[in-house]
């Protein structure tokens, strides 16, 4: 069971001094989002017992394994259900505390009732302030039963629950009609999933026989020990004022555990600490009684005295729960209460005994949970004890459970049960994860989900080149850190597998599934340099470069050209995918921009050194498009174009350029310059008769501007085939070259 205790301080003279503390003895509990899992949660649960809203309660974390709830301002804040949740994953456990108002009309004789499946549970509500009206019983907040006030027996209202089953578990309450719910008696019923003394699926396994009021857990067969007791069977008392599964916690304050209620994981529930009883755990046990809630009776024999915390204290020469065993009777010594082994191992188990007559090898035996008896293979005889050594056959999962060492002599017999946990070595369920790669190294995250049992003590990473028959290389790594595999071959696939181990002999698990991780290519080392560049338009740039001559094949897949526009903080990248290329045309650039240009060789995803940078200034963009372009056929070989000058010119136009193309034709268009920029019309001559042409034009200042709209026009009639179109501006006689 999870080592989780919810402590309620019941010194109720002042609610502001009331506090609840949840203490976890689990390793690393409560540290929150780190590797150890979720934190401790402590809260009031208003789902069943609803109380009027008050100021929020204060939660304080004290170290990694303790959380305290304070800030109760009035007694009604205390009434209800509180829960603490701790442990990680499948071990996540909720501990519940139910608080009753000391001034309620009805009070529970006993708050927590733990019963076995099939038992009859009897809840008893004692009349504290009588009302002559019905009593309503509820289960988990819903109506359950009614009693007339005349049905009280000896000042108590009883609710009998025959043949209880696990779903009957929960919070029960008894309330007088017309009274505030805060005046109810609240109970907690815990129904174990099995009949008395049984546990496990199908309830086929036998409980270890929990002592001192411990309760056998119906899922794992472990004893949940009352506060103040420890051991597999709760056979050992803690020192006064201590609690926790290993007696590792100390009750706060000078009066020890007085006034504290302890709540433990189900099926234990809540009780006073060892040596105390009463509704507020403030009364010491009566003579002859001891333990949690003083429920145990000493019945000491042979001069033993009763200690209210630990039970019988035996005089010299006697031992046993009631001092009923003579020291001459053999006695098992210092047997560990719990042992852990890994699956399929063949451990040695030692069992030591003393007594008179002295135990010999044959008088000590070991019994497995299935009843198999093992005899010792050797014994070490010392003056004060005999230690028998047992060689255990290969362990299987069914060997988990309670083993028993038994010694028998003519003086009597003794036995000691201990728990053996057979753990399954961890096996990775997934392959390790590649984080980054270089040409000669891989960075790998080795920690993956796994089947079997933790904790993980070591992680081994096995790797070798893919399809290789050579031995695996192995590296042992810390479970929580990434690992770098070094001195690898470039551009090589490696098969990588994880192997996990848990503590103890035979803790190494099987190897996990392989994954293929490939190292990067070798880095390209050659540095190109820029031979030159020239502007082919306001947004076009042709670049050429060279590489140094070196022997051997070129290590590279292509080139990356980078243009940096410092003004806008933008980078343009152009990929040239041939390693033989030494020139590239860059288009779509921003006119009038100052660029920094460089070139790098690349190989796979790796970049070589960049060339020394060049600085390039593109000319600004040209003027806007001419407006209202119009075409008019004059003859079978002439078409006149008219237009209007562009608007918002940034400077004087140096010329116009006319583009002529036969409609639907496949050839390249012809460009004709109009060098008289003041003109707004021109005649295109030398055209073919009866042919449809497309025209558009643009102006130039320092650079060419935007194209105008395209216009269509057909030449007239049928004439001779012309040599090709030429142009004539108005008031200009000479033709222009195409």
């Amino acid at each position: 069971a999870v080592d989780l205790t919810l402590l309620a301080n019941l010194r109720l003279t002042d609610p502001q001094r009331f506090f609840l503390t949840c203490v976890s003895g689990e390793a690393g509990a409560g540290r929150g989002s780190d590797a150890w899992g979720p934190p401790l949660l402590l809260e009031k649960d208003d789902r069943i017992v609803r109380t009027p809203p008050g100021p929020p309660l204060r939660l304080a974390r004290n170290g990694s394994h303790q959380v305290t709830l304070r800030g109760f301002s009035k007694p009604s804040d205390l009434v209800g259900v509180f829960s603490c949740v701790g442990g990680a994953g499948a071990r996540r456990t909720r501990v519940i505390y139910v608080h009753n108002s000391p001034g309620a009309h009805l009070l529970p004789d006993k708050v927590t009732h733990t019963v076995n499946k099939g038992d009859t549970a009897v809840l008893s509500a004692r009349v504290h302030k009588e009302k002559q009206t019905d009593v309503i019983w509820k289960s988990n907040g819903s109506y359950f039963y009614t009693l007339d006030w005349h049905e009280a027996q000896d000042g108590r209202f009883l609710l009998q629950l025959p043949n209880v089953q696990p779903p009957s578990s929960g919070i029960y309450s008894a309330t007088y009609l017309e009274a505030s719910p805060l005046g109810s008696a609240f109970f907690r019923l815990i129904v174990r999933g099995c009949g008395a003394g049984r546990w496990g699926p199908g309830c086929t396994k036998e409980c270890p026989g929990c002592l001192h009021g411990g309760v056998c857990h119906d899922h794992d067969g472990e004893c949940v020990c009352p506060p103040g007791f420890t051991g597999t069977r709760c056979e050992q008392a803690c020192r006064e004022g201590r609690f926790g599964q290993s007696c590792q916690e100390q009750c706060p304050g000078i009066s020890g555990c007085r006034g504290l209620t302890f709540c433990l994981p189900d099926p234990y529930g809540c009780s006073c600490g060892s040596g105390w009883r009463g509704s507020q755990c403030q009364e010491a046990c009566a003579p002859g009684h001891f333990g949690a809630d003083c429920r145990l009776q000493c019945q000491c024999q042979n001069g033993g005295t009763c200690d209210r915390f630990s039970g019988c204290v035996c005089p010299s020469g006697w031992h046993g729960v009631h001092c009923e065993k003579s020291d001459r009777i053999p006695q098992i010594l210092n047997m560990a209460s719990e042992l852990e082994f890994n699956l399929e191992t063949m451990p040695r188990i030692n069992c030591a005994a003393a007594g008179n007559p002295f135990p010999v090898r044959g008088s000590i035996e070991l019994r497995k949970p299935d009843g198999t008896v093992l005899l010792s293979t050797k014994a070490i005889v010392e003056p004060e004890k005999t230690t028998a050594e047992f060689e255990v056959p290969r362990l299987v999962l069914a060997d988990s459970g309670f083993w028993e060492c038994r010694v028998s002599t003519s003086g009597g017999q003794d036995s000691r049960r201990f728990k053996v946990n057979v753990k399954v070595p961890p096996v990775p369920l997934a392959a390790p994860r590649l984080l980054t790669k270089q040409s000669r190294q891989l960075v790998v995250s080795p920690l993956v989900s796994f089947s079997g049992d933790g904790p993980i003590s070591t992680v081994r990473l096995h790797y070798r080149p893919q399809d290789s028959t050579m031995d695996w290389s192995t590296i042992v790594v810390d479970p929580s850190e990434n690992v770098t595999l070094m001195n690898l071959r470039p551009k090589t696939g490696y098969s990588v597998r994880v192997q996990l181990s848990r503590p103890g002999e035979g803790g190494e698990g099987a190897w996990g599934p392989p994954t293929l991780m490939t190292t990067d290519c070798p880095e390209p080392l050659l540095q190109p340099w820029l031979e030159g560049w020239h502007v082919e338009g306001t947004d076009r740039l042709r670049v050429s470069w060279s590489l140094p001559l070196v022997p051997g094949p070129l290590v590279g897949d292509g080139f990356l050209l980078r243009l940096w526009d410092g003004t806008r903080g933008q980078e343009r990248r152009e990929n040239v995918s041939s390693p033989q290329a030494r020139t590239a045309l860059l288009t779509g650039l921003t006119p009038g921009t100052h660029y920094q240009l460089d070139v790098q060789l690349y190989h796979c995803t790796l970049l070589g050194p960049a060339s020394p940078p060049a600085h390039v200034l593109l000319p600004p963009s040209g003027p806007p498009a001419p407006r209202h372009l119009h075409a008019q056929a004059l003859s079978d070989s002439e078409i006149q174009l008219t237009w209007k000058h562009p608007e918002a010119l940034p400077g004087p136009i140096s010329k116009y350029v006319v583009e002529v193309q036969v409609a639907g034709g496949a050839g390249d268009p012809l460009w004709i310059d109009v060098d008289r920029p003041e003109e707004t019309s021109t005649i295109i001559r030398g055209l073919n008769a009866s042919t449809r042409y497309l025209f558009r034009m643009r102006a130039s200042i320092q650079g060419l501007g935007d194209w105008s709209n395209t216009v269509e026009e057909s030449t007239l009639g049928n004439g001779l085939q012309a040599e090709g179109p030429v142009q004539e501006s108005r008031a200009a006689e000479e033709g222009l070259d195409q």
Epitope: I136, Y145, E178, S180
Partner: antibody, heavy 127, light 102 residues
Framework: EVQLLESGGGLVQPGGSLRLSCAAS????????MSWVRQAPGKGLEWVSS????????KYADSVKGRFTISRDNSKNTLYLQMNSLRAEDTAVYYC????????????????????WGQGTLVTVSS | DIQMTQSPGTLSLSPGERATLSCRAS???????LAWYQQKPGQAPRLLIY???SRATGIPDRFSGSGSGTDFTLTISRLEPEDFAVYYC?????????FGQG
């Protein structure tokens, strides 16, 4: 679905006896308090008797005390009303009803109410 | 015994109007013990309100209850045709029920 079905009504002479039954289904009969309520022709409702779940406690209206007996058989999910020494003023439709208890608010006291009723059975006392 | 008196004996209203029904106890009644029922001709009564002001399951929110001590009120905010019926108030005390005359 909760259902209450009364039976056993009929015509009886003054001074005679009659036993009414109420068969319950659709709920756990054995945990609920049950009541009989009657309604004389053209008149209002009058509570007659109640019985607690265990059957050990019963309550009666003054007008029927000593003449009527309420009982229940939890194994048969049935409520009974044994009516003796019947009078003309006992003529009425007799309803059986389930008593439920509600949380009137999250934090307030519990409130009772007759949440399910049968369709009633007519008892006529006449010579 | 506590007597419950309802008024008015008859309330003549039209659909869409607001209805206010009054119930007075001969001595103080705990609010949690006051309930209202509706009965239509030829049918069994139906629980409307418990604890003086809480609507029973399935009761439309046009029905509301209020009051404390000796004076209690059932209000139907906007009458629907199916709301025309006889209404009874009821108190529970000393393990006995008392109804108003309707």
């Amino acid at each position: 679905e909760v259902q209450l079905l009364e039976s056993g009504g009929g015509l009886v002479q003054p001074g005679g006896s009659l036993r009414l039954s109420c068969a319950a289904s659709g709920f756990t009969f054995s945990i609920y308090k049950m009541s009989w309520v009657r309604q004389a022709p053209g008149k209002g409702l009058e509570w007659v008797s109640s019985i607690y779940p265990s059957g050990g406690q019963t309550k009666y209206a003054d007008s029927v005390k000593g003449r009527f007996t309420i009982s229940r058989d939890n194994s048969k999910n049935t409520l009974y009303l044994q009516m003796n020494s019947l009078r003309a003023e006992d003529t009425a439709v007799y309803y059986c009803a389930r008593v439920n208890y509600y949380d009137s608010s999250g934090y307030g006291p519990i409130a009772p109410g007759l949440d399910y009723w049968g369709q009633g059975t007519l008892v006529t006392v006449s010579s | 015994d506590i007597q419950m008196t309802q008024s008015p004996g008859t309330l003549s209203l039209s659909p869409g109007e607001r209805a206010t029904l009054s119930c007075r106890a001969s001595q103080s009644v705990s609010s949690s013990y006051l309930a209202w029922y509706q009965q239509k001709p030829g049918q069994a009564p139906r629980l409307l309100i418990y604890g003086a002001s809480s609507r029973a399951t399935g009761i439309p929110d046009r029905f509301s209850g209020s009051g404390s001590g000796t004076d209690f009120t059932l209000t139907i905010s906007r009458l629907e045709p199916e709301d025309f019926a006889v209404y009874y108030c009821q108190q529970y005390g000393s393990s006995r029920w008392t109804f108003g005359q309707g």
